[in-house]
C-alpha cells in the first residue's frame, strides 16, 4: 500500500479525501487535517509538513492550503447571535436572534430581519428550524384564541367556565377568550334574552 | 515525550483555597488550549474550566463559576487552576488535559495522572 | 449543555467476544459544513486518566487496536470492540465537542463474563 509521496501517473489518489494531486512532481502528498495548515510543500521524498492554525484562525476540511481562515464573529448588527465558538477545526457558528429570521443568505445567514405580527386570532406556523423563515400566519384551531398582534404570541385554549365552577358568560372566538361568570350572578341586559330563552 | 504532570492538591477545609499547577513538556505549550477536569470518586468525568493557547480566552462550568479561576504561564509552560471558597462536592481527582486546538472546546489527546483534591472538615 | 446519555452501564463480555456500547446525545453533534461528528471516546483503565480512542466519532488515534471502532451521527453513537481482550477491560466514556460546555457521558464498565 502506497504512502504519500507516492507516483501517480493518472492524476488520482488513492484517498480523496486526505491526499492530493501535486502535479508539478506528479506526486500523491497528504493533506493536512482540519486546525492545520501546510507550513513546508510536499516533494519526491518528503510529504506535507502540517502546522497548528493559531488562535482565532480555522480550516475545517484536510486541506492543503498554506493558510487558516480567520475567525469571524457573529454580527448582531446584522441580527447573528454566537451559537457556538471558532475553534482551529470550525468557524463560529451563528443564528438570527430570537424574534428574527434569516433574510440573506450565501452558504450561510448574513443577515436577519424581524419576524412579522401575526394578528389577533392567527399564529406563526411551526418550522421545523427556527429562523430559517418569515412568519406563516395560520388562524387559530377551533376551541383555541389569540388576541394580541405579535410575532411569536400561540394560539391558547379557550378556558372551560365549568371547570371553575362557573358559567359560560359569553362564548370564546378566535381573537378572545370564552367569558365566564358567577352562576348566581344576573345575566349583563343585552345577552337576557338569551337566558330567557 | 508529551507529558503533563499535576500538583498542589490534598486536604482543605469548606471554605478553604487551593491552588493546581500542571507542568507540560514535550508540545508547543502555548499552541495549544487546555483544560481541567476533574472525577468525584466513582461519579463521571466533568470539565471545569478551559483556557485558550494564548490565555485571551476562559470558561467555567457553571459548578464553578466565580470561585475558580483558570491561567497559564507560556514561557514555563505552565497552567493552574485557583480554587477559593472550596465545598465538599468539589472533593475529586484534578485532571489537566490538552486539546488538539487552540480552544478548548476539543478532543483531549493527553491527559496527567491527576491531583487528589478533598475537601472536608 | 448538551447531555450525554451512556447505555448501558455495565457489560460483561466473554473474552474474544463482540463488546457495543452506545452514546446518545441530547442535540445533534454533527456539523453540517464538514460533516463532522464532534464526538469522542476514551478508556480510563483503574487508577489511570482517561486515555483517548477515537474521534471525529469514527476516527481512531494513532497506536490504537483496529478493533476499536466506532459509528454513528448526529445524536446516537456507539462504540465496538470486536473481539474483547483482556487488557480492555475498563470504563469508556463518550464526550461532545459541539458545543461549550464540553460534556462527557457517565461512562460503561467493560468486564470480562
Known amino acids: 500500500q502506497a504512502v504519500p509521496p507516492y507516483a501517480s501517473e493518472n492524476q488520482t489518489c488513492r484517498d480523496q479525501e486526505k491526499e492530493y494531486y501535486e502535479p508539478q512532481h506528479r506526486i500523491c502528498c497528504s493533506r493536512c487535517p482540519p486546525g492545520t495548515y501546510v507550513s513546508a510543500k510536499c516533494s519526491r521524498i518528503r510529504d506535507t509538513v502540517c502546522a497548528t492554525c493559531a488562535e482565532n484562525s480555522y480550516n475545517e476540511h484536510w486541506n492543503y492550503l498554506t493558510i487558516c481562515q480567520l475567525c469571524r464573529p457573529c454580527d448582531p448588527v446584522m441580527g447573528l447571535e454566537e451559537i457556538a465558538p471558532c475553534t482551529s477545526k470550525r468557524k463560529t457558528q451563528c443564528r438570527c436572534q430570537p424574534g428574527m429570521f434569516c433574510a440573506a443568505w450565501a452558504l450561510e445567514c448574513t443577515h436577519c430581519e424581524l419576524l412579522s405580527d401575526c394578528p389577533p386570532g392567527t399564529e406563526a406556523e411551526l418550522k421545523d428550524e427556527v429562523g430559517k423563515g418569515n412568519n406563516h400566519c395560520v388562524p387559530c384551531k377551533a376551541g383555541h384564541f389569540q388576541n394580541t398582534s405579535s410575532p411569536s404570541a400561540r394560539c391558547q385554549p379557550h378556558t372551560r367556565c365549568e371547570n371553575q365552577g362557573l358559567v359560560e358568560a359569553a362564548p370564546g372566538t378566535a381573537q378572545s377568550d370564552t367569558t365566564c361568570k358567577n352562576p348566581l350572578e344576573p345575566l349583563p341586559p343585552e345577552m337576557s334574552g338569551t337566558m330567557l330563552m | 515525550e508529551v507529558q503533563l504532570v499535576e500538583s498542589g492538591g490534598g486536604l482543605v477545609q469548606p471554605g478553604g483555597s487551593l491552588r493546581l499547577s500542571c507542568a507540560a513538556s514535550?508540545?508547543?505549550?502555548?499552541?495549544?488550549?487546555m483544560s481541567w477536569v476533574r472525577q468525584a470518586p466513582g461519579k463521571c468525568l466533568e470539565w471545569v474550566s478551559g483556557?485558550?493557547?494564548?490565555?485571551?480566552?476562559?470558561n467555567y462550568a457553571d459548578s464553578v463559576k466565580g470561585r475558580f479561576t483558570i491561567s497559564r504561564d507560556n514561557s514555563k509552560n505552565t497552567l493552574y487552576l485557583q480554587m477559593n471558597s472550596l465545598r465538599a462536592e468539589d472533593t475529586a481527582v484534578y485532571y489537566c488535559?490538552?486539546?488538539?486546538?487552540?480552544?478548548?472546546?476539543?478532543?483531549?489527546?493527553?491527559w496527567g495522572q491527576g491531583t487528589m483534591v478533598t475537601v472536608s472538615s | 449543555d448538551i447531555v450525554m446519555t451512556q447505555s448501558p452501564d455495565s457489560l460483561a463480555v466473554s473474552l474474544g467476544e463482540r463488546a457495543t456500547i452506545n452514546c446518545k446525545s441530547s442535540?445533534?453533534?454533527?456539523?453540517?459544513?464538514?460533516?463532522?461528528?464532534?464526538l469522542t471516546w476514551y478508556q480510563q483503565k483503574p487508577g489511570q486518566p482517561p486515555k483517548l480512542i477515537i474521534y471525529?466519532?469514527?476516527t481512531r488515534e494513532s497506536g490504537v487496536p483496529d478493533r476499536f471502532s466506532g459509528s454513528g451521527s448526529g445524536t446516537d453513537f456507539t462504540l465496538t470492540i470486536s473481539s474483547l481482550q483482556a487488557e480492555d477491560v475498563a470504563v469508556y466514556y463518550c464526550?461532545?465537542?459541539?458545543?461549550?460546555?464540553?460534556?462527557f457521558g457517565c461512562g460503561t464498565k467493560v468486564e470480562i463474563k
Open positions: 488535559a490538552k486539546s488538539d486546538n487552540w480552544h478548548y472546546l476539543d478532543a483531549f489527546d493527553i
Open positions: 514535550g508540545f508547543t505549550f502555548s499552541s495549544y488550549a
Open positions: 483556557i485558550s493557547g494564548s490565555g485571551g480566552r476562559t
Open positions: 442535540q445533534n453533534v454533527l456539523y453540517s459544513s464538514n460533516n463532522k461528528n464532534y
Open positions: 471525529w466519532a469514527s
Open positions: 464526550q461532545q465537542y459541539f458545543n461549550t460546555p464540553p460534556t
